[in-house]
């Protein structure tokens, strides 16, 4: 804190400002009749030296020059950039109690002269909008730096605006606050900026440019489309845009798409025939502007128009599958199928389907329409059928798909051979077969359906399948696939009015089951012991389970038990065992294996026969 | 109703300096472009500076260097600085104000609105 130098005064040669690098005096003079006493020897003056308001040196020792007890000289050299504080005070040393007193200060700023701007750029953002150019500074100067910006145009007219930089604020862009009009869209105009400190001064290059090459038109707004006669596919686009523009770039895309649609349009004058738009999708289109053909910049893009495109008739055929199941010796139920339509191909909303069945020879017609993805109708069990859907939005309907009702499994020399189903990953099976070996009639196609073996499963959920071609003998089912599950895959073969099927078991991933099966029941007949018991819990099977194990030994007995295993099947729930001593009793229980190893044991059982056994 | 007033006019030799103010009544300096013109007897007004309500500042390049436009926003006045006069700087100066923003119209007189009475200067060789 200086006071307002009432005892002397404090003087910089060559400047208060100097370049970095540069010496500097400081001069330190006491006013006539301030002191410490009568005896001017007394009065000793220092120099102290503050960098943000830190102490950092006493310059006593840098003494060049000194009037005892009037004035010293101090020379100061290796200044920082930036700005020092030197202050003055006054020492009387013949009183050391008394804390030296300030006489006067003064701040040294150091920096260097700026460099030349470069790299000048205008824009002007739309046709009235105002002008404002950047550039870069080069160097930090350390100093307070004031830039002039000079725009020169036609009828020998010069604007001019200033801003400057300092420790606080950077000036490396003007806005000129005023607007190039397109009556001067031919017009040159030369802009440079000076930049003037107390070191030096220096210009930029001269930078030429037309209006046309600044002005950035604002982006085109009030974006509309309106489709042709309700047309799914063709639209016109429709915009407004600045005067001037002659070019503009459209770009479209559906919503869900990473890559965009470009057109480039000239003289469009804010109209766009589109031909290629998907029907019943859902778009964004956004629009450009440029004020020539050839020069200047493009607009920003214009605010998204998200729009959907009207509907069209359905295109494509229905995937079609069925189930047949006799319900008696004269009437069997049909149970239809089928995947909705890709979007592209629903082209709208499908608001239900139209199923017909017809018996071709006696040309019964069975026809309905559902909102579902099935159709199940009981029909006489003779007699040649066939089925065939269409799926219907607004605008119509798609082709009739059909398809032969023929006995899935029925023809044995139809049924694939070697059918394999290996688990690929955590959501996928790959399953394999041969082609039949005898067929009488060629393999259309084969289907491969799959479905959780879940009870209920059947009636509960529709199968999944994939059509695969007849060259083909693999397929990679991942639909709804999800591991620990076993799955009963059927490959069927089907001609123009046969099937013949294989059936096999799979799972995309197992472990060993969480519980052996629960015996139930051990009854004796014919000297003979049957085993009775209730599978695993769908969810503690955890795969496809191969085998059980009936392990049985002698209660008490320490010796290694006795087992029987048997191959896995869903409809089995009991099994006979004749190796049994009577009168003897036993301990008995059960362990299910999957390809992961065996499940715990289940419950045990004592059983004591009483016939006599072989 | 708006009212500008110019003064500072006067006799001066060639080169010296004049300073030319003009007080504002009625609209606010800060809100729109001020000009100066300036008409020789049997001539054509033509224009001799502008401020834009941004600051910016237009001369013609014939004066560039010898004149200098300003703004006092408090006062609500507007200044030219004249140096270096010269005979042939002898005139009527007016004062002018109006909504202008683009760079050519700062130097249309039919672009302003308000125009003060003018004050006469006179530099003798």
């Known amino acids: 804190n200086i006071d307002v130098c009432k005892l002397g005064t404090v003087t910089v040669q060559p400047a208060p400002v100097i370049p970095l690098g540069s010496a500097a005096n400081i001069s330190c003079s006491l006013n006539p009749k301030q002191g410490c006493s009568h005896y001017p020897s007394s009065n000793e003056l220092i120099l102290l030296k503050f960098v943000n308001d830190v102490l950092v040196e006493n310059l006593h020792g840098k003494k060049v020059h000194d009037h005892t007890g009037h004035s010293s000289t101090f020379q100061v050299t290796n200044l920082s950039l930036g700005m020092t504080l030197f202050v003055c005070k006054l020492n009387c040393s013949n009183s050391q109690k008394k804390p030296p007193v300030p006489v006067c200060g003064v701040e040294i700023s150091v920096g260097v002269a700026p460099e030349p701007p470069q790299n000048i750029s205008c824009v002007q953002e739309g046709e009235n909008g105002t002008v404002a150019c950047s550039w870069n500074s080069g160097k930090v100067t350390y100093l307070k730096t004031n830039y002039t910006l000079q725009l020169s145009g036609p009828n020998n007219l010069t604007c001019q605006k200033q801003c400057f930089s300092d420790n606080r604020q950077n000036c490396n862009r003007l806005d000129l606050g005023i607007n190039l009009s397109p009556d001067l869209a031919e017009s040159r105009f030369i802009v440079r900026v000076t930049a003037i400190n107390d070191l030096g001064n220096s210009s930029s290059l001269p930078h030429t440019f037309t209006f046309l090459d600044i002005v950035i038109p604002l982006p085109p707004w009030d974006i509309r489309i309106n489709f042709l006669n309700a047309s799914g596919s063709r639209g016109t686009l429709q915009w407004e845009d600045e005067g001037q523009v002659v070019l503009n770039q459209l770009r479209y895309q559906p919503l869900n798409s990473t890559s965009w649609n470009m057109v480039n349009a000239t003289n469009a004058k804010g109209k766009y025939d589109l031909r290629d738009l998907r029907p019943f999708t859902e778009y964004e289109f956004q629009i450009s502007s440029k004020l020539h053909l050839s020069g200047g910049s493009w607009s920003n893009w214009s605010e998204s128009l998200r729009t959907r495109t009207p509907e069209e008739e359905p295109v494509g055929i229905l995937d079609i599958w069925y189930m047949k199941q006799d319900i008696d010796y004269d009437r069997q139920q049909i149970s239809l199928f089928w995947k909705s339509l890709n979007p592209s191909e629903a082209r709208g909303k499908i608001l239900h389907y139209q199923v017909t069945l017809q018996e071709v020879t006696k040309k019964t017609t069975l026809q309905n329409t559902t909102r579902h993805t099935s159709w199940t109708r009981v029909i006489p069990r003779t007699g040649a059928w066939t089925a065939s859907v269409s799926a219907a939005n607004s605008k119509g309907a798609s082709a009739p798909t059909h398809i032969n009702i023929v006995d899935l499994c029925g023809t044995g020399l139809l049924a694939p051979h070697q059918v394999s189903a290996k688990s690929e990953n955590m959501d996928n099976i790959l399953v394999t077969w041969q082609p039949p070996k005898k067929a009488d009639s060629a393999v259309r196609e084969y289907i491969v359906e799959w479905r959780a073996l879940q009870p209920g499963s059947i009636t509960k959920f529709p199968p999944h399948w994939l059509r695969i071609p007849p060259d083909n003998m693999s397929a990679l089912i991942s639909e709804n696939i999800k591991p620990y599950i076993c799955y009963e895959i059927r490959v069927h073969a089907l001609s123009e009015s046969q099937g013949g099927c294989s059936s096999i078991r799979g799972d995309s991933k197992h472990k060993a089951p969480v519980s052996g099966p629960h015996i139930t029941a051990i009854t004796e007949k014919k000297e003979r012991l049957f085993i009775s018991w209730t599978h695993i819990p769908f969810p503690e099977q955890r795969g496809c389970i191969l085998h059980y194990r009936i392990y049985w030994k002698e209660r008490d007995s320490t010796a290694q038990p006795e087992l029987c295993e048997i191959q896995y099947r869903r409809s089995q729930n009991s099994h006979p065992i004749s190796s049994l001593q009577p009168r003897v009793t036993y301990v008995l229980w059960m362990t299910a294996v999957t390809a992961a190893g065996e499940s715990p044991q289940g419950n045990e059982r004592e059983f004591c026969p009483q016939g006599k056994a072989n | 109703q708006v009212q500008l007033q110019e003064s500072g006019g006067g006799s001066v030799q060639a080169g010296g300096s004049l300073r030319l103010s003009c007080a504002v009544s009625g609209r606010t300096v800060s809100d729109y472009a001020m000009g100066w013109f300036r008409q020789a007897p049997g001539k054509e007004r033509e224009f001799v500076a502008a401020?834009?309500?941004?600051?910016?500042?237009v001369y013609p390049n014939s004066m560039k260097g010898r004149i200098t436009i300003s703004r006092d926003n408090a006062k609500n006045a507007v200044y030219l600085q004249l140096n270096a006069l010269k005979p042939e700087d002898t005139a009527v100066y007016y004062c002018?104000?109006?909504?202008?923003?683009?760079?050519?119209?700062?130097?249309?007189?039919?672009?302003?609105?308000?125009w003060g009475q003018g004050t006469q200067v006179t530099v003798s060789s």
């Open positions: 002018s104000m109006g909504p202008i923003a683009t760079f050519q119209g700062l130097a249309r007189q039919n672009e302003y609105h308000y």
């Open positions: 401020m834009s309500s941004s600051e910016t500042t």
